[in-house]
């Protein structure tokens, strides 16, 4: 006999990094005939929704209308379907971004690079933070973590196309409160004709659009809400 | 975009039954939401008649005294209302209504149903 | 039976007025309350769900608020296209009850 409901999915909507005071809703999808919905954050219960028809009950929706640094944790989500519950979902790590200053983020030997080459990015930060995050921008999200008093290093190695896009950095004041992004550094690599023509490119975002990217970034992930859980957790462990 | 469309005889005899039906385009009655009837005396206010869900469980109001069946076919993405023993006090413009927050709800055009002998 | 008492049964006001319509329940409700438009010859159309919560699609000056026995329907700035019957809907309990309607008129 089953003991335990499949676990739900959980989501940020728009995104799981949020600017302080902007707002963000908190997504939980279970399944149909959920009587009950629970929110937990940091291990402990944050909000319940219970569903009637005519509202959906399979996805319950929590809303967070100021983001500051009290909201930005781990969250979890469990589902009650008559007195049977699910498992716990997997942890959303919701973090508040634009919190206090503001990195500068610099490569070597420069932004126009060979294939094959070397690079490197900087990303300095003059406040107390020891943790650095290097972001290329694009539906992937791709993202490092690097330590230092007031700069980190991020190797990248020997270069190729797939390299090619614009990067951001952020410092990190916890896992979970980041400071505001650096300026875009557009890193441009050449290589020859058939390795250009054939190399994947993430999409990239003029150096004011940064709000927008942080709503687009994931938008082909919301329809997968197992993929969009992988891809949260993977970026803060 | 999902689509609904009700039908059924525009005039019915006090003591029989009103039957009606809603076709659903473009969206399967079985796959979410809540399938509605709702009606309208003219000049009056909406009174919900009940609802069939997208698993097929019913909810109907007592005040029609058991006299009252939603039904659906499947295969036809349809649902049904049938009202027995109607009399004149069931003049109305009857709606059928998809509906399933957050998301926007869907409403057939509503098609009067007058009780006269 | 949940009994719906709609407050006015009509209103007059102008395009650019923000105006308050009320809905108060029989009995606590626990917030499970949404709100319609409908247009002379036309179908409902939802505006606000769980008392506060705007259907996908809805104008944001439409915004709901109230909890326990009294909720309140606000437009903050009334549109020419906003001029309508306006219904509450209870559905805390079984059977849904509607309120009576409140009639939007231009003034």
């Known amino acids: 006999q089953q003991q335990t409901l499949p676990k739900p999915f959980i989501w940020a909507e728009p995104h799981f990094m949020v600017p302080k005071e902007k707002q963000v809703t908190i997504c939980c999808q279970g399944n149909y005939g959920a009587v009950e919905y629970q929110l937990h954050f940091e291990g402990s219960l944050f909000a319940v929704d219970r569903p009637k028809p005519p509202e959906r009950i399979n996805k319950v929706q929590f809303y967070i209308p100021d983001m500051n640094s009290r909201m930005a944790g781990q969250y979890s989500c469990i589902y009650r379907v008559g007195e049977l519950w699910s498992e716990p979902s997997n942890l959303l790590d919701l973090v508040v971004t634009e919190m206090y200053d503001t990195p500068t983020l610099s490569v070597h030997p420069g932004p126009e690079v060979i294939s094959g080459e070397k690079v490197t990015f900087y990303c300095r930060l003059d406040t107390a933070t020891s943790m650095f995050l290097l972001l290329k921008e694009g539906r992937s999200s791709h993202v490092q973590r690097g330590y230092g008093k007031v700069q980190a290093e991020f190797p990248l190695g020997p270069v190729t196309t797939a390299h090619r896009g614009t990067y951001r950095c952020f410092g990190s004041y916890n896992n979970h409160a980041w400071s505001f992004p650096s300026e875009p550094v557009k890193l441009l690599v050449t290589g020859d004709i058939e390795n250009t023509s054939l190399a994947p490119e993430d999409p990239t975002f003029p150096a004011d659009t940064w709000g927008t990217y942080l709503l687009t970034t994931e938008t082909g992930l919301q329809k997968d809400h197992a993929l969009w859980d992988h891809t949260a957790q993977n970026l803060l462990r | 975009q999902v689509q609904l469309q009700e039908s059924g005889p525009g005039l019915v005899k006090p003591s029989q039954t009103l039957s009606l039906t809603c076709t659903v385009s473009g969206y399967s009655i079985t796959s979410d939401d809540y399938w509605n009837w709702i009606r309208q005396p003219p000049g009056k206010g909406l009174e919900w008649i009940g609802y069939i869900s997208y698993e097929g469980s019913n909810n109907y109001n007592p005040s029609l005294k058991n006299r009252v069946t939603i039904s659906r076919d499947t295969s036809k993405n349809q649902f049904s209302l049938k009202l027995s023993s109607v009399t004149a006090a069931d003049t109305a413009v009857y709606y059928c209504a998809r509906l399933g927050y957050p998301a926007m709800d869907a409403w057939g055009q509503g098609t009067l149903v007058t009780v006269s002998s | 039976d949940i009994q719906m008492t709609q407050s006015p049964s009509s209103l007059s006001a102008s395009v650019g007025d923000r105006v308050t319509i009320t809905c108060k329940a029989s009995q606590d409700i626990n917030s499970y309350l949404s709100w319609f438009q409908q247009k002379p010859g036309k179908a409902p159309k939802s505006l606000i769900y769980?008392?506060?919560r705007l259907v996908d699609g809805v104008p944001s000056r439409f915004s709901g608020s109230g909890s326990g026995t009294d909720y309140t329907l606000t437009i903050s700035s009334l549109q020419p296209e906003d001029f309508a019957t306006y219904y509450c809907l209870q559905y805390d309990e079984f059977p849904w009850t509607f309120g009576g309607g409140t009639k939007l008129e231009i003034k």
């Open positions: 769980r008392a506060n």
